[in-house]
Interface confidence: low
């Protein structure tokens, strides 16, 4: 094995609970470890987990490159978090899930150069900065070199939301001075998204997983997915989805290496579902298809997608009002 | 110390598919990327793809997609590469090798593979 | 994709000479991401230099690196005779991650 950039002692050194250091204006030694946290030089690994910590720790050695900072009490990330002096210039993979982050601020990730990994999961996000991510407001960005953003389950509990649209405050963040556009893994999963805004998919031309899975998506009707050529999985597992149509199908089918996943969705299995159970029938891109079933109408319930005929999609002819019963 | 262990050379015919396999340690395993690389005798080196062990995350050169199956196995801290439909010009040396932004800090010793009919 | 052009394919350098390597990028790169590795026969690459400048622990003092932008350089300020080995460029900034043909150094 080659040698790496730090010296390699191998084991974790965990630093003593009394050994809290004060924020000093010098820099960190390289084999210091912050109290509460464990550390391995070898393996770059800082791990600061389950400790009740209220902020990120001051004293991160500079040759931290995996971070982990969950199941901790942090409410607020500011701006410039990270930011240190030598800048933590190594830092690859951050991971935050698990705290009690309410807010991330404008430029909390700046300062780090080769973050490629970002996990905010688990955290009930009431306030994300529409630059949280981009790090300034100007209308282009410089790029962020993030490649996965793992977003799942950041919607906080319905009487702490803002009298705004969740799906906007998360948009706005990804869109934010064209800064993600390397993009390659965004899981949105377990989020309430009633909808996806149209412009987001466009903006995010380097996706290669999107997890919009346990969400409450009741349709895509207005969701382009054309731009996204490198797509390689779709998680619509668990949604509300009622029939994709035609237009989203082609899309689909179009993307040269797609798989689709559509498990647990109530479909409804009326005239409006011609189309798809076609194109079911005929596309490779739908993983495990077979487990399709109906929701509605009742007549239909668990009835297999790929086993219905045009005979069986009917709609109920619309009666005039006069006979109409309430 | 980190220390990643490949398989032994591989002796494969023409058409037939092979999985070789790095085994790693001295560190935890789902924390780091472990990429492959491709080096034919006396020529430069030539990026497979990567895996994320963490969240499974597996990204390929376009050059080796459909043919390089990349697959980890947290239990065993072990990653696999399996290539198929093999032609003479994938006998090579395959190394794999952990790091990512920064350089690939430490490196398997490499596994031979020959395409002989 | 970023395709890296090193030069010279082969040199020949004395001991105690000073040695230049260089790698020319087809578009820029970040220089956080530009490496380079040292190889000798039958053995795996080593990483010699991370992020155009900073040498990997072990690597002696003799050894540099610099550059930006498309243009990157290796220099060795006094050649010994362990110097004596293969070395590639690498770029980790754009996918597919690519590396150059190689400067192969030869003791004259």
């Known amino acids: 094995s080659s040698s790496s950039p730090t010296s390699s002692a191998s084991s974790f050194s965990s630093s003593a609970p009394f050994l809290a250091s004060a924020v000093s204006a010098q820099p960190p030694l390289p084999d210091q470890c912050p109290a509460l946290c464990e550390c391995s030089e070898a393996a770059r690994t800082v791990k600061c987990v389950n400790r009740n910590l209220l902020e990120v720790p001051a004293d991160l050695p500079p040759y931290v490159r995996n971070l982990f900072l969950t199941g901790n009490q942090m409410t607020v990330l500011p701006a410039g978090a990270f930011a240190r002096q030598p800048p933590l210039a190594d830092l690859e993979a951050l991971n935050l899930s698990g705290n009690h982050l309410k807010e991330v601020c404008a430029g909390a990730f700046e300062h780090l150069p080769g973050l490629r990994r970002l996990d905010l999961s688990h955290n009930p996000l009431t306030n994300l900065s529409a630059f949280a991510f981009a790090g300034s407001n100007a209308s282009v960005s410089a790029p962020s070199p993030l490649v996965e953003l793992i977003l799942n389950h950041i919607v906080p509990p319905e009487d702490e939301r803002q009298n705004r649209s969740f799906e906007g405050m998360v948009v706005a963040a990804l869109l934010a001075g064209r800064a993600l556009q390397g993009l390659r893994r965004l899981e949105l999963a377990s989020n309430h998204f009633l909808y996806l805004p149209r412009d987001v998919l466009a903006q995010l031309p380097s996706l290669r997983h999107l997890d919009l899975s346990n969400n409450s998506l009741v349709s895509l009707t207005y969701v382009s997915f054309r731009n996204l050529t490198h797509l390689e999985s779709l998680h619509l597992e668990d949604n509300a989805l009622k029939v994709l149509h035609n237009g989203t199908l082609a899309e689909l089918q179009g993307l040269p290496h797609i798989r689709v996943f559509l498990d647990n969705n109530p479909w409804v299995c009326d005239c409006h579902m011609a189309d798809m159970v076609t194109w079911l029938k005929e596309t490779e891109v739908v993983q495990g298809k077979d487990r399709l079933t109906c929701a509605y109408p009742e007549k239909m319930r668990n009835r297999v997608l790929l086993e219905l005929n045009s005979a069986d999609l009917d709609c109920d002819p619309i009666l005039p009002p006069s006979l109409q019963t309430s | 110390q980190v220390q990643l262990q490949q398989s032994r050379p591989e002796l494969v015919k023409p058409g037939a598919s092979v999985k070789m396999s790095c085994k790693a340690s001295?560190?935890?395993?789902?924390?780091?990327?472990i990429s492959w690389v491709k080096q034919r005798t006396g020529q430069g080196l030539e990026w497979i793809g990567e895996?994320?062990?963490?969240?499974?995350?597996?990204y390929y050169n376009e050059k080796f997609k459909g043919r390089a199956t990349l697959t980890a196995d947290k239990s065993s801290s072990t990653a696999y590469m399996q290539l198929s439909s093999l032609t003479s010009e994938d006998s090579a040396v395959y190394f794999c090798?952990?790091?990512?932004?920064?350089?690939?800090?430490?490196w398997g010793q490499g596994t031979t593979l020959t395409v002989s009919s | 994709q970023i395709v890296l052009t090193q030069s010279p394919a082969i040199m020949s350098a004395s001991l105690g000479e000073r040695v230049t390597l260089t790698c020319t990028a087809s578009?820029?790169?970040?220089?956080?991401?530009l490496h380079w590795y040292q190889q000798k026969p039958g053995s795996s690459p080593k990483l010699w230099i991370y992020?155009?400048?900073n040498l990997a622990s072990g690597v002696p003092a003799r050894f540099s690196g610099s550059g930006s932008g498309t243009s990157y350089s290796l220099t060795i300020s006094s050649m010994e005779a362990e110097d004596a080995a293969t070395y590639y460029c690498?770029?980790?900034?754009?996918?597919?991650?690519?590396f150059g043909a190689g400067t192969k150094l030869e003791l004259k």
């Open positions: 578009s820029s790169v970040n220089s956080n991401y």
């Open positions: 001295g560190y935890t395993f789902t924390d780091y990327v």
């Open positions: 090798a952990m790091g990512g932004n920064y350089g690939f800090d430490y």
């Open positions: 992020s155009t400048s």
């Open positions: 895996i994320y062990p963490g969240s499974n995350s597996i």
């Open positions: 690498h770029q980790y900034h754009r996918s597919p991650l690519t």
